[in-house]
Protein backbone atom coordinates (compact mmCIF):
# COMPACT_ATOMS: atom_id res chain seq x y z
CA UNK A 1 0.00 0.00 0.00
CA UNK A 2 1.43 3.36 -1.07
CA UNK A 3 0.40 7.00 -1.25
CA UNK A 4 0.02 8.07 -4.86
CA UNK A 5 -0.90 11.71 -4.21
CA UNK A 6 0.31 13.18 -0.90
CA UNK A 7 -2.18 14.75 1.50
CA UNK A 8 -3.06 18.39 0.93
CA UNK A 9 -4.95 20.22 3.64
CA UNK A 10 -7.05 23.36 3.95
CA UNK A 11 -8.41 25.00 7.10
CA UNK A 12 -11.70 26.82 7.56
CA UNK A 13 -9.88 28.93 10.21
CA UNK A 14 -12.54 27.99 12.68
CA UNK A 15 -12.81 24.38 13.76
CA UNK A 16 -12.04 21.99 10.91
CA UNK A 17 -9.15 21.30 8.58
CA UNK A 18 -9.75 18.96 5.66
CA UNK A 19 -7.00 16.78 4.21
CA UNK A 20 -7.32 14.83 0.96
CA UNK A 21 -5.00 12.29 -0.66
CA UNK A 22 -4.97 9.41 -3.12
CA UNK A 23 -3.72 5.87 -2.65
CA UNK A 24 -2.19 3.71 -5.37
CA UNK A 25 -5.24 1.50 -5.55
CA UNK A 26 -8.76 0.99 -4.18
CA UNK A 27 -8.66 1.46 -0.40
CA UNK A 28 -11.15 1.23 2.43
CA UNK A 29 -9.91 4.45 4.02
CA UNK A 30 -11.83 4.17 7.30
CA UNK A 31 -10.66 0.66 8.14
CA UNK A 32 -7.14 0.64 6.67
CA UNK A 33 -5.81 4.14 7.38
CA UNK A 34 -5.39 6.63 10.21
CA UNK A 35 -4.18 10.23 9.99
CA UNK A 36 -2.52 11.41 13.21
CA UNK A 37 -2.15 15.13 13.78
CA UNK A 38 -0.32 16.90 16.57
CA UNK A 39 0.23 20.55 17.34
CA UNK A 40 3.93 21.39 17.46
CA UNK A 41 3.88 22.25 21.16
CA UNK A 42 5.65 20.61 24.10
CA UNK A 43 2.52 19.62 26.00
CA UNK A 44 0.42 18.25 23.15
CA UNK A 45 -0.58 14.72 22.27
CA UNK A 46 -1.45 13.25 18.90
CA UNK A 47 -5.07 13.20 17.79
CA UNK A 48 -6.47 10.61 15.41
CA UNK A 49 -8.58 11.30 12.35
CA UNK A 50 -10.47 8.43 10.75
CA UNK A 51 -10.60 9.06 6.99
CA UNK A 52 -13.54 8.52 4.69
CA UNK A 53 -13.51 7.34 1.10
CA UNK A 54 -13.53 10.00 -1.58
CA UNK A 55 -13.71 8.00 -4.78
CA UNK A 56 -12.10 4.59 -5.26
CA UNK A 57 -8.53 5.41 -4.26
CA UNK A 58 -9.19 8.80 -2.68
CA UNK A 59 -9.43 9.53 1.05
CA UNK A 60 -10.55 12.59 2.99
CA UNK A 61 -10.13 13.38 6.68
CA UNK A 62 -11.72 16.14 8.75
CA UNK A 63 -9.36 17.24 11.53
CA UNK A 64 -11.04 18.82 14.55
CA UNK A 65 -9.10 21.79 15.90
CA UNK A 66 -11.50 23.92 18.02
CA UNK A 67 -10.09 27.09 16.53
CA UNK A 68 -6.92 28.27 14.85
CA UNK A 69 -4.30 30.85 15.78
CA UNK A 70 -1.78 32.07 13.26
CA UNK A 71 1.19 30.41 14.95
CA UNK A 72 -0.30 26.90 14.86
CA UNK A 73 1.74 24.26 13.06
CA UNK A 74 0.87 20.57 12.95
CA UNK A 75 2.77 17.40 12.20
CA UNK A 76 0.79 14.87 10.16
CA UNK A 77 1.46 11.13 10.09
CA UNK A 78 -0.47 8.80 7.79
CA UNK A 79 -0.51 5.23 9.07
CA UNK A 80 -1.68 1.91 7.64
CA UNK A 81 -1.66 -0.29 10.72
CA UNK A 82 1.94 -0.18 12.00
CA UNK A 83 3.32 1.16 8.69
CA UNK A 84 4.06 4.87 8.37
CA UNK A 85 3.07 5.77 4.81
CA UNK A 86 3.72 9.51 4.87
CA UNK A 87 4.89 12.23 7.21
CA UNK A 88 4.35 15.94 6.71
CA UNK A 89 3.37 19.21 8.31
CA UNK A 90 0.55 21.69 7.95
CA UNK A 91 0.19 25.31 9.01
CA UNK A 92 -3.56 26.11 8.92
CA UNK A 93 -3.12 29.89 8.64
CA UNK A 94 -1.20 29.42 5.38
CA UNK A 95 -3.85 27.19 3.77
CA UNK A 96 -7.21 28.78 4.46
CA UNK A 97 -10.39 28.03 2.56
CA UNK A 98 -13.22 30.04 4.15
CA UNK A 99 -16.57 28.53 4.95
CA UNK A 100 -19.29 29.19 2.38
CA UNK A 101 -21.72 32.04 3.11
CA UNK A 102 -25.26 30.98 3.92
CA UNK A 103 -28.87 32.17 3.93
CA UNK A 104 -28.71 33.87 0.55
CA UNK A 105 -31.97 35.78 0.06
CA UNK A 106 -33.17 37.93 -2.81
CA UNK A 107 -35.49 40.78 -1.79
CA UNK A 108 -37.54 41.88 -4.79
CA UNK A 109 -39.92 44.31 -3.11
CA UNK A 110 -37.61 47.33 -2.94
CA UNK A 111 -38.96 49.47 -5.83
CA UNK A 112 -37.01 48.37 -8.90
CA UNK A 113 -33.93 47.34 -6.97
CA UNK A 114 -32.86 43.83 -6.19
CA UNK A 115 -31.35 43.43 -2.73
CA UNK A 116 -29.34 40.27 -2.18
CA UNK A 117 -28.32 39.48 1.40
CA UNK A 118 -26.46 36.55 2.92
CA UNK A 119 -24.88 35.58 6.21
CA UNK A 120 -21.23 35.82 7.14
CA UNK A 121 -20.19 32.21 7.90
CA UNK A 122 -18.05 33.21 10.89
CA UNK A 123 -18.94 34.36 14.40
CA UNK A 124 -17.91 37.92 15.32
CA UNK A 125 -15.01 36.74 17.50
CA UNK A 126 -13.34 34.92 14.60
CA UNK A 127 -10.56 36.84 12.85
CA UNK A 128 -12.05 36.22 9.40
CA UNK A 129 -15.39 37.76 10.34
CA UNK A 130 -14.21 41.27 9.47
CA UNK A 131 -11.95 40.25 6.59
CA UNK A 132 -14.20 38.50 4.10
CA UNK A 133 -15.09 39.85 0.69
CA UNK A 134 -17.50 38.15 -1.66
CA UNK A 135 -18.33 37.29 -5.24
CA UNK A 136 -21.98 37.00 -6.24
CA UNK A 137 -22.82 34.95 -9.31
CA UNK A 138 -26.16 35.59 -11.05
CA UNK A 139 -27.31 33.60 -14.06
CA UNK A 140 -30.39 33.02 -16.13
CA UNK A 141 -31.95 29.59 -16.14
CA UNK A 142 -33.12 30.20 -19.71
CA UNK A 143 -29.98 31.64 -21.25
CA UNK A 144 -26.57 30.11 -20.38
CA UNK A 145 -24.85 33.19 -21.84
CA UNK A 146 -26.59 35.45 -19.31
CA UNK A 147 -24.03 34.83 -16.55
CA UNK A 148 -22.46 37.54 -14.45
CA UNK A 149 -20.20 37.99 -11.41
CA UNK A 150 -20.42 40.93 -8.99
CA UNK A 151 -17.44 41.52 -6.70
CA UNK A 152 -18.45 42.75 -3.24
CA UNK A 153 -15.29 44.31 -1.80
CA UNK A 154 -16.93 45.97 1.21
CA UNK A 155 -17.63 44.09 4.45
CA UNK A 156 -21.43 44.20 4.45
CA UNK A 157 -22.87 40.90 3.20
CA UNK A 158 -25.28 42.44 0.71
CA UNK A 159 -25.52 43.56 -2.89
CA UNK A 160 -27.94 46.00 -4.54
CA UNK A 161 -28.48 45.96 -8.26
CA UNK A 162 -31.09 47.55 -10.48
CA UNK A 163 -33.65 44.96 -11.56
CA UNK A 164 -33.43 46.48 -15.03
CA UNK A 165 -29.85 45.22 -15.44
CA UNK A 166 -31.43 41.78 -15.80
CA UNK A 167 -34.05 40.68 -18.29
CA UNK A 168 -37.64 40.97 -17.18
CA UNK A 169 -40.05 38.07 -17.07
CA UNK A 170 -37.55 35.29 -16.64
CA UNK A 171 -36.13 33.33 -13.74
CA UNK A 172 -32.66 33.90 -12.35
CA UNK A 173 -30.49 32.12 -9.82
CA UNK A 174 -27.82 33.55 -7.54
CA UNK A 175 -25.07 32.13 -5.36
CA UNK A 176 -22.25 33.68 -3.34
CA UNK A 177 -18.77 32.72 -2.22
CA UNK A 178 -16.14 34.31 0.01
CA UNK A 179 -12.43 34.86 0.37
CA UNK A 180 -10.09 36.77 2.66
CA UNK A 181 -7.19 38.75 1.27
CA UNK A 182 -5.41 38.95 4.63
CA UNK A 183 -4.54 35.25 4.54
CA UNK A 184 -4.46 34.99 0.75
CA UNK A 185 -7.13 32.31 1.02
CA UNK A 186 -8.65 30.27 -1.74
CA UNK A 187 -12.29 30.93 -2.56
CA UNK A 188 -14.89 29.20 -0.44
CA UNK A 189 -17.35 26.81 -2.02
CA UNK A 190 -20.42 28.47 -3.49
CA UNK A 191 -23.41 28.87 -1.24
CA UNK A 192 -26.57 27.00 -2.19
CA UNK A 193 -28.26 28.95 -4.97
CA UNK A 194 -31.54 30.77 -4.64
CA UNK A 195 -34.08 31.40 -7.41
CA UNK A 196 -36.41 34.30 -8.18
CA UNK A 197 -38.55 35.56 -11.01
CA UNK A 198 -37.28 38.90 -12.26
CA UNK A 199 -40.02 41.35 -13.18
CA UNK A 200 -40.00 45.11 -13.18
CA UNK A 201 -41.95 47.92 -14.78
CA UNK A 202 -40.43 49.04 -18.06
CA UNK A 203 -39.90 52.84 -18.01
CA UNK A 204 -42.66 54.63 -19.94
CA UNK A 205 -41.25 55.80 -23.26
CA UNK A 206 -42.38 59.17 -24.58
CA UNK A 207 -42.50 59.71 -28.36
Amino acid sequence: MKVLQEPTCVSDYMSISTCEWKMNGPTNCSTELRLLYQLVFLLSEAHTCIPENNGGAGCVCHLLMDDVVSADNYTLDLWAGQQLLWKGSFKPSEHVKPRAPGNLTVHTNVSDTLLLTWSNPYPPDNYLYNHLTYAVNIWSENDPADFRIYNVTYLEPSLRIAASTLKSGISYRARVRAWAQCYNTTWSEWSPSTKWHNSYREPFEQH
Epitope: F41, L42, M65, D66, D67, S70
Partner: antibody, heavy 121, light 106 residues
Protein backbone atom coordinates in the same frame (compact mmCIF):
# COMPACT_ATOMS: atom_id res chain seq x y z
CA UNK B 1 -22.13 25.22 31.60
CA UNK B 2 -18.58 24.21 32.51
CA UNK B 3 -17.90 23.55 36.20
CA UNK B 4 -14.72 22.49 37.98
CA UNK B 5 -14.79 21.74 41.69
CA UNK B 6 -11.69 20.89 43.72
CA UNK B 7 -11.70 18.94 46.97
CA UNK B 8 -9.21 17.24 49.29
CA UNK B 9 -7.30 20.25 50.59
CA UNK B 10 -6.47 20.69 54.24
CA UNK B 11 -3.90 21.05 56.96
CA UNK B 12 -0.99 18.61 56.73
CA UNK B 13 2.38 18.08 58.42
CA UNK B 14 5.70 18.27 56.53
CA UNK B 15 6.51 14.94 54.91
CA UNK B 16 2.85 14.01 54.71
CA UNK B 17 0.70 13.17 51.69
CA UNK B 18 -2.72 14.03 50.34
CA UNK B 19 -4.76 13.69 47.18
CA UNK B 20 -6.59 16.56 45.54
CA UNK B 21 -9.58 15.84 43.32
CA UNK B 22 -11.31 17.95 40.70
CA UNK B 23 -14.80 17.05 39.51
CA UNK B 24 -15.57 18.31 36.01
CA UNK B 25 -18.88 18.80 34.22
CA UNK B 26 -20.34 20.64 31.25
CA UNK B 27 -17.81 19.58 28.60
CA UNK B 28 -16.37 16.45 26.99
CA UNK B 29 -13.80 15.84 29.68
CA UNK B 30 -11.79 13.15 27.88
CA UNK B 31 -10.92 15.37 24.92
CA UNK B 32 -9.21 18.18 26.86
CA UNK B 33 -5.88 18.34 28.65
CA UNK B 34 -6.24 19.35 32.29
CA UNK B 35 -3.89 21.24 34.55
CA UNK B 36 -3.04 22.04 38.15
CA UNK B 37 -1.88 25.56 38.99
CA UNK B 38 -1.07 26.89 42.47
CA UNK B 39 -0.94 30.25 44.18
CA UNK B 40 1.29 30.41 47.26
CA UNK B 41 0.80 33.18 49.85
CA UNK B 42 2.45 36.38 48.68
CA UNK B 43 3.60 34.75 45.44
CA UNK B 44 2.35 34.55 41.88
CA UNK B 45 0.65 31.81 39.88
CA UNK B 46 2.75 28.71 39.27
CA UNK B 47 1.91 25.98 36.78
CA UNK B 48 2.28 22.62 38.52
CA UNK B 49 1.29 19.84 36.12
CA UNK B 50 -0.58 18.91 32.93
CA UNK B 51 -2.20 15.68 31.77
CA UNK B 52 -3.39 15.04 28.22
CA UNK B 53 -7.00 14.16 27.42
CA UNK B 54 -6.28 10.43 27.17
CA UNK B 55 -4.07 10.48 30.24
CA UNK B 56 -1.16 9.16 28.20
CA UNK B 57 1.00 12.25 28.56
CA UNK B 58 1.93 14.03 31.81
CA UNK B 59 4.31 16.82 32.68
CA UNK B 60 5.42 18.59 35.86
CA UNK B 61 7.24 21.71 36.95
CA UNK B 62 10.76 20.91 38.20
CA UNK B 63 10.07 21.64 41.87
CA UNK B 64 7.40 18.91 42.16
CA UNK B 65 8.85 16.28 39.82
CA UNK B 66 8.98 12.91 41.59
CA UNK B 67 6.73 14.03 44.48
CA UNK B 68 3.50 14.91 42.67
CA UNK B 69 1.49 12.61 40.40
CA UNK B 70 -1.29 13.85 38.13
CA UNK B 71 -3.93 11.40 36.91
CA UNK B 72 -7.46 11.34 35.58
CA UNK B 73 -10.46 9.03 35.40
CA UNK B 74 -12.35 9.88 32.23
CA UNK B 75 -15.20 7.53 33.13
CA UNK B 76 -15.87 9.64 36.23
CA UNK B 77 -14.88 13.06 34.78
CA UNK B 78 -12.33 13.46 37.54
CA UNK B 79 -8.82 14.89 37.75
CA UNK B 80 -6.43 14.07 40.59
CA UNK B 81 -3.18 15.32 42.07
CA UNK B 82 -1.38 13.01 44.48
CA UNK B 83 1.03 15.04 46.60
CA UNK B 84 3.74 13.26 48.59
CA UNK B 85 6.56 14.37 50.90
CA UNK B 86 5.01 17.79 51.42
CA UNK B 87 7.15 20.77 52.41
CA UNK B 88 6.24 24.25 53.65
CA UNK B 89 6.88 25.54 50.10
CA UNK B 90 3.91 23.51 48.89
CA UNK B 91 1.50 25.62 50.97
CA UNK B 92 -0.82 27.19 48.40
CA UNK B 93 -4.26 27.32 46.89
CA UNK B 94 -4.37 24.61 44.22
CA UNK B 95 -6.55 25.21 41.16
CA UNK B 96 -7.56 22.74 38.49
CA UNK B 97 -7.92 24.33 35.06
CA UNK B 98 -9.15 23.18 31.65
CA UNK B 99 -7.22 23.76 28.44
CA UNK B 100 -9.03 26.21 26.19
CA UNK B 101 -8.52 24.06 23.09
CA UNK B 102 -8.47 20.34 22.42
CA UNK B 103 -5.06 20.81 20.80
CA UNK B 104 -3.77 23.05 23.60
CA UNK B 105 -1.43 26.05 23.57
CA UNK B 106 -3.94 28.85 24.16
CA UNK B 107 -4.21 28.89 27.93
CA UNK B 108 -6.82 27.78 30.43
CA UNK B 109 -10.38 28.99 30.02
CA UNK B 110 -12.12 27.45 33.05
CA UNK B 111 -10.82 27.20 36.60
CA UNK B 112 -12.08 25.69 39.82
CA UNK B 113 -12.51 27.76 42.97
CA UNK B 114 -9.32 26.34 44.46
CA UNK B 115 -8.37 23.99 47.31
CA UNK B 116 -6.18 25.29 50.12
CA UNK B 117 -3.28 23.09 51.18
CA UNK B 118 -1.45 24.22 54.33
CA UNK B 119 1.78 22.45 55.30
CA UNK B 120 2.88 23.16 58.87
CA UNK B 121 4.14 21.35 61.90
CA UNK C 1 12.97 26.56 30.63
CA UNK C 2 11.35 29.71 29.28
CA UNK C 3 11.29 32.59 31.78
CA UNK C 4 8.60 35.28 31.69
CA UNK C 5 9.31 38.77 33.04
CA UNK C 6 6.46 41.20 33.64
CA UNK C 7 6.72 44.94 34.21
CA UNK C 8 5.84 46.86 36.19
CA UNK C 9 5.33 44.69 39.26
CA UNK C 10 2.68 47.13 40.47
CA UNK C 11 1.02 50.29 39.29
CA UNK C 12 -1.64 52.74 40.34
CA UNK C 13 -3.88 54.53 37.86
CA UNK C 14 -7.15 56.41 37.76
CA UNK C 15 -10.47 55.34 36.24
CA UNK C 16 -10.50 56.25 32.55
CA UNK C 17 -6.72 55.96 32.19
CA UNK C 18 -5.02 53.90 29.51
CA UNK C 19 -2.85 51.26 31.15
CA UNK C 20 -0.14 49.09 29.61
CA UNK C 21 1.53 46.02 31.11
CA UNK C 22 4.43 44.35 29.32
CA UNK C 23 5.73 40.80 29.35
CA UNK C 24 9.03 39.56 27.97
CA UNK C 25 9.94 35.93 27.23
CA UNK C 26 13.50 34.64 27.58
CA UNK C 27 13.21 33.11 24.10
CA UNK C 28 10.79 33.35 21.19
CA UNK C 29 7.36 31.90 21.98
CA UNK C 30 5.77 32.90 18.66
CA UNK C 31 2.30 34.16 19.64
CA UNK C 32 1.59 31.59 22.35
CA UNK C 33 1.09 34.17 25.10
CA UNK C 34 -1.98 34.46 27.31
CA UNK C 35 -3.10 37.08 29.84
CA UNK C 36 -5.11 36.48 33.02
CA UNK C 37 -6.79 38.65 35.62
CA UNK C 38 -7.00 37.48 39.22
CA UNK C 39 -8.86 39.16 42.06
CA UNK C 40 -8.19 38.31 45.74
CA UNK C 41 -9.81 35.03 46.77
CA UNK C 42 -10.98 34.30 43.22
CA UNK C 43 -9.78 32.00 40.44
CA UNK C 44 -7.83 33.53 37.56
CA UNK C 45 -9.80 34.60 34.48
CA UNK C 46 -8.49 34.24 30.93
CA UNK C 47 -8.56 37.63 29.16
CA UNK C 48 -6.41 37.25 26.05
CA UNK C 49 -5.08 34.14 24.33
CA UNK C 50 -2.61 33.75 21.48
CA UNK C 51 -1.20 37.25 22.18
CA UNK C 52 -4.10 39.22 20.74
CA UNK C 53 -7.34 37.21 20.71
CA UNK C 54 -10.00 38.37 23.14
CA UNK C 55 -11.53 35.55 25.15
CA UNK C 56 -15.31 35.31 24.86
CA UNK C 57 -17.14 37.52 27.35
CA UNK C 58 -14.16 39.78 28.08
CA UNK C 59 -14.78 43.54 27.65
CA UNK C 60 -13.28 45.07 24.51
CA UNK C 61 -11.29 47.60 26.55
CA UNK C 62 -8.77 44.77 27.03
CA UNK C 63 -6.41 44.12 24.14
CA UNK C 64 -3.14 42.32 23.59
CA UNK C 65 -0.32 42.60 21.09
CA UNK C 66 3.15 41.31 20.34
CA UNK C 67 4.91 38.22 19.08
CA UNK C 68 8.27 36.56 19.54
CA UNK C 69 9.56 37.77 22.89
CA UNK C 70 7.77 41.06 23.63
CA UNK C 71 4.08 41.34 24.49
CA UNK C 72 1.71 43.97 25.81
CA UNK C 73 -1.64 43.98 27.59
CA UNK C 74 -3.53 47.26 27.25
CA UNK C 75 -6.62 48.43 29.12
CA UNK C 76 -7.90 51.32 27.05
CA UNK C 77 -10.11 52.98 29.66
CA UNK C 78 -9.61 51.74 33.19
CA UNK C 79 -12.73 50.82 35.18
CA UNK C 80 -12.93 50.44 38.98
CA UNK C 81 -13.59 46.70 38.61
CA UNK C 82 -10.24 46.28 36.81
CA UNK C 83 -8.37 46.44 40.12
CA UNK C 84 -6.62 43.03 40.22
CA UNK C 85 -3.36 41.21 39.61
CA UNK C 86 -2.56 40.48 35.96
CA UNK C 87 -0.42 37.58 34.80
CA UNK C 88 1.07 36.67 31.46
CA UNK C 89 1.58 33.00 30.65
CA UNK C 90 3.48 31.38 27.83
CA UNK C 91 2.09 28.17 26.41
CA UNK C 92 4.79 27.51 23.82
CA UNK C 93 6.58 25.16 26.21
CA UNK C 94 5.71 24.33 29.78
CA UNK C 95 3.13 26.82 31.01
CA UNK C 96 5.31 29.45 32.70
CA UNK C 97 3.59 32.46 34.29
CA UNK C 98 5.03 35.92 34.76
CA UNK C 99 5.42 37.12 38.35
CA UNK C 100 2.29 39.28 38.11
CA UNK C 101 1.41 42.97 37.98
CA UNK C 102 -0.75 44.38 40.74
CA UNK C 103 -3.03 47.11 39.41
CA UNK C 104 -4.62 49.51 41.86
CA UNK C 105 -7.25 52.12 41.06
CA UNK C 106 -6.50 55.52 42.62
Amino acid sequence: EVHLLESGGGFIQPGGSLRLSCAASGFTFSTYAMNWVRLAPGKGLEWVSTISGSGGFTSYTDSVQGRFTISRDNSKNKLYLQINNLTAEDTAVYYCAKDRRIVGATGFDYWGQGALVTVSS
Amino acid sequence: DIQMTQSPSSLSASAGDRVTITCRASQSISSYLNWYQQKPGKAPKLLIYAASSLQSGVPSRFSGSGSGTDFTLTISSLQPEDSATYYCQQSYGFHTFGQGTRLEIK
